[in-house]
């Protein structure tokens, strides 16, 4: 086909000789044809159409990519001739850097729907060169990691040695989708979530007297996990005293947040302190009530069949522990004023007498 009518874009890939990095070309088809072939995600800010016939990427027809040999030979089908270059919908991924990637790349729709579509193509002139050794040593990596739950930032490798003030306007894409919120050389992330993982592309324009080039870099961002540096945090009970009714059943819940640990051995126990005695109570198993990638909330309840006078003199202690350390929360029971009748008190005293006998034969010291 005749490529003279293709729109042209010039791109520069300055790769680091010290690291493995990838490169991506987007098939920036002119409107309105682009909307037939590429997902909205590949559009630049000025190219977003009112309507896209395909909203789900699985419905999208592909584009065909070619490479134009410098000697004027016929166009080469990239899939057949270049195993290190991968075609994926509307993008072309270069797995390995090298000056041999320099050349002209043409994309056009695979399915021609109208005579006008024949001229619907983009020619990308790609220049690939190693980064000069003069460029700064601490340039950002093409593989960047963000720690889940913390703050972080993604830096554009080709601009990471420049201050924000010096930096030109940058266009960012994530997984091919334009990120219109930021135009600086760094994306600041207030709190890292899994969705921040992906392939980021940063573009800026470099002009000389002769022409204008888009300088592009690709960053693979991973969200990573790490062990907490904090002891578990008791969320409930919050108060150190709890109003109760004598003779009535009572459940005290202990809820604690445990930060992520690769080897997770949470400990959650209930103790009772009575004068100089202290013992662990046999209570139902702890259960996880909320689990995320950065922490887990665990609950364990202590159940009293009926609150007795003796219970009012005791301290109920929730103890939680991880590999960093432990936290405790004590709860003292306090009788609700004006609650319960004479029968309740007699009943409670009867339970207390039975309980005294039971504890004398069963309690043990906790060290």
């Amino acid at each position: 086909f005749n490529i003279s009518g293709c729109s042209t874009k010039k791109l520069l890939w300055a790769y680091s000789t010290r690291s493995e990095e990838e490169f991506i070309l987007f098939c920036d088809l002119p409107e309105p044809q682009k909307s037939h072939f590429c997902h909205r995600s590949q559009l630049s800010p000025t190219q977003v159409p009112d309507h896209l016939p395909f909203t789900d990427s699985k419905d999208l027809p592909d584009v065909q990519w070619y490479r134009q040999p410098s000697n004027g030979d016929p166009l080469e089908d990239i899939r057949k001739s270049y195993p290190h270059i991968i075609q994926d919908k509307c993008t072309l991924r270069f797995l390995t850097p090298g000056v041999n990637n320099t050349g002209s790349y043409i994309c056009r729709p695979k399915m021609i729907k109208s005579p006008y579509d024949v001229a619907c193509c983009v020619k990308m002139i790609l220049e690939v060169k190693p980064q000069s050794n003069a460029s700064c040593e601490n340039s950002a990596s093409h593989k960047q990691d963000l720690l889940l739950g913390s703050t972080g930032s993604i830096s554009c490798p080709s601009l990471s040695c420049q201050s924000d003030a010096q930096s030109p306007e940058v266009t960012w894409y994530k997984n091919g989708k334009l990120l219109s919120m930021t135009r600086s050389n760094r994306i600041v992330v207030d709190e890292v979530y899994i969705y921040h993982q992906g392939t980021y592309v940063c573009d800026y324009t470099q002009s000389d007297t002769a022409s204008s080039w888009t300088v592009r870099a690709v960053v693979q961002v991973r969200t990573i996990v790490g062990d907490t540096k904090l002891k578990p945090d008791i969320l409930d009970p919050v108060e150190s005293t709890l109003e109760v009714e004598l003779g009535k059943p009572l459940t005290i819940s202990c809820k604690a947040r445990f930060g992520f640990e690769r080897v997770f051995n949470p400990v959650m126990k209930w103790y009772i302190k009575d004068a100089d005695l202290e013992w662990e109570v046999s209570v139902p198993e702890a259960k996880s009530i909320k689990s995320t990638l950065k922490d887990e909330i665990i609950e364990r309840n202590i159940i009293l069949e009926k609150v007795t006078q003796r219970d009012l003199r005791r301290t109920f202690v929730c103890f939680v522990q991880n590999s960093i350390g432990n936290t405790t929360q004590s709860v003292q029971l306090k009788e609700k004023r004006g609650s319960g009748g004479l029968n309740d008190i007699f009943e409670a005293q009867k339970i207390e007498w039975h309980e005294t006998v039971r504890f004398q034969s069963h309690h043990h010291h906790h060290h």
Partner: antibody, heavy 124, light 107 residues
């Protein structure tokens, strides 16, 4: 760009303590786990243990009684000490960055950056 | 400890061949398996994680599959630089363990 470099004596006497240090350059030691792995001559790989930059550790039970891994974040280094060595501890010792990659509802751990390895011979 | 058994222990193949290496776990490990490539005198290089996810920069001729106890590493068309020893590694439970390795040689 992260690079790891093991250092330490290449020869250790039996019953003594093997001490190695891994220096991390081109990146921070923070936020990552750091592992030690060894490979006896002509054999496969054996994981020794890891340390998180905050200091939490996990060791291979088969070596636990003899192993200590520590970290010095100010120097961007982590170290291995293996006590009471015998000829069976002769191996190439590697340090590696151990990453927990989060994806959907689980994690995948991989050793994505390795040192070039240092040979340690246990002999009198 | 979970044992990983690789087969074959060694194999000879030619450039352009399709090669499959298997790794069997002594108990179910979900998809918590990684593959590494090691060349003589060099440190291992990480290729695949989560049984089938390719590390960025690793050629697409490498692929991994499997879940539970049976896993495979496939090289669709061998290149000269692929001749090396390959190790599988499980992260499902501690201690972390490696397979004994599969040595891939030029025929």
């Amino acid at each position: 760009q992260v690079q790891l470099q093991e250092s330490g004596p290449g020869l250790v006497k039996p019953s003594e303590t093997l001490s190695l240090t891994c220096t991390v350059s081109g990146g921070s030691i923070n936020n990552y786990y750091w592992s030690w792995i060894r490979q006896p001559p002509g054999k496969g790989l054996e994981w020794i243990g890891y340390i998180f930059y905050s200091g939490t550790t996990n060791y291979n039970p088969s070596l636990k009684s003899r192993v200590t891994i520590s970290v010095d974040t100010s120097k961007n280094q982590f170290s291995l000490k293996l006590s009471s060595v015998t000829a069976a501890d002769t191996a190439v010792y590697y340090c590696a960055r151990d990453v927990g990659i989060a994806a959907r509802n689980s994690y995948y751990y991989v050793m994505d950056v390795w040192g070039q390895g240092t040979t340690v011979t246990v002999s009198s | 400890a979970i044992q990983l058994t690789q087969s074959p222990s060694s194999l000879s193949a030619s450039v352009g061949d399709r090669v499959t290496i298997t790794c069997r776990a002594s108990q179910g490990i979900s998809s918590a398996l990684a593959w590494y490539q090691q060349k003589p005198g060099k440190a291992p290089k990480f290729l695949i994680y989560d049984a089938s996810s390719l590390e960025s920069g690793v050629p697409s001729r490498f692929s991994g599959s499997g879940s539970g106890t049976d896993f495979t590493l496939t090289i669709s068309s061998l290149q000269p630089e692929d001749f090396a020893t390959y190790y599988c590694q499980q992260f499902n439970s501690y201690p972390i363990t490696f397979g004994q390795g599969t040595r891939l040689e030029i025929k």
